[in-house]
Amino acid sequence: GSSPRSGVLLRGCPTHCHCEPDGRMLLRVDCSDLGLSELPSNLSVFTSYLDLSMNNISQLLPNPLPSLR
């Protein structure tokens, strides 16, 4: 289901990534150096910045982040 509208929930942050607010709606997401072999599956549509450096992602499918604007 969809996340409730809330200012107290730390929602939209993929498991094990580090996140911080970027204005009222957006999130900066740092998933660097986590040993990931694929993109995190639960990225918020409100992700403004995504760091995937220092991982093991060898290839990306076409349109790998369809949820992002």
Epitope: R5, S6, G7, V8, C13, H16, R24
Partner: antibody
């Protein structure tokens, strides 16, 4: 700098209602949610609820439904919590705190509410 | 509701010590955890959000770690000004819930 000003103390009789205030300054009031948290003497912290000052949308802890009502006055950048049918169990410190995307980053000093006849 | 447990309610340490305060959630909270410091005068301050993100102005001797249900706050080189009660809080689901607090005292 960011400030959330709360009255230091309130003394109210059992059965009555009280409206506690939290005046915000140093930031754009409607850009952040306002949280309310209860702390009984010597106890932990308990979330009451939250309000989005931009449109007064609220979420409540089910435990405080019917007990607490959250409102805002954007013209004075003030948030309020009204507590009804007061009993000794409502005697506590009540904190307001602003939040954004889950980071509850500034807290008021708290208002000590004493319910006593 | 998710239950947050801080098994150590009080902790005694010496200045300069490395102190670890733990917090356990009743279910996986996916790193959605905040740590707060409450001084004896009641002042509350956010130290760490999203498990490990240090708030601006918070000394680097504070750090947060953990995953799943188990999390910890570490203070290296304990200073007098760190004497306070520390609370964890989950921000994974409504209602957000707090641990019972760990009171840090100087030995």
């Amino acid at each position: 700098q960011v400030q959330l000003q709360q009255p230091g103390a309130e003394l109210v009789k059992p059965g009555a209602s009280v409206k506690l205030s939290c005046k915000a300054s140093g930031y754009t009031f409607t850009d952040y949610w306002m949280q309310w948290v209860k702390q009984r003497p010597g106890q932990g912290l308990e979330w009451i609820g939250e309000i989005d000052p931009s449109d007064s949308y609220t979420n409540y802890n089910q435990k405080f439904q019917g007990k607490a009502t959250l409102t805002v006055d954007t013209s004075s950048s003030t948030a309020y919590i009204q507590l009804s049918s007061l009993t000794s169990d409502d005697s506590a410190v009540y904190y307001c705190a602003r939040s954004l995307s889950g980071s509850v980053d500034y807290w008021g000093q708290g208002t000590t509410l004493t319910v006593s006849s | 509701d998710i239950q947050m447990t801080q098994t150590t309610s009080s902790l005694s340490a010496s200045l300069g010590d490395r102190v670890t305060i733990s917090c356990r959630a009743s279910q996986d909270i996916s790193n959605r955890l905040n740590w707060y410091q409450q001084k004896p005068d009641g002042t509350v301050k956010l130290l760490i959000s999203y498990r490990s993100r240090l708030q601006s102005g918070v000394p680097s001797r504070f750090s947060g770690s953990g995953s799943g249900t188990d999390y910890s706050l570490t203070i290296t080189n304990l200073e007098q000004e760190d004497i306070a009660t520390y609370f964890c809080q989950q921000g994974n689901t409504l209602p957000p819930t707090f641990g019972g607090g760990t009171k840090l005292e100087v030995r």
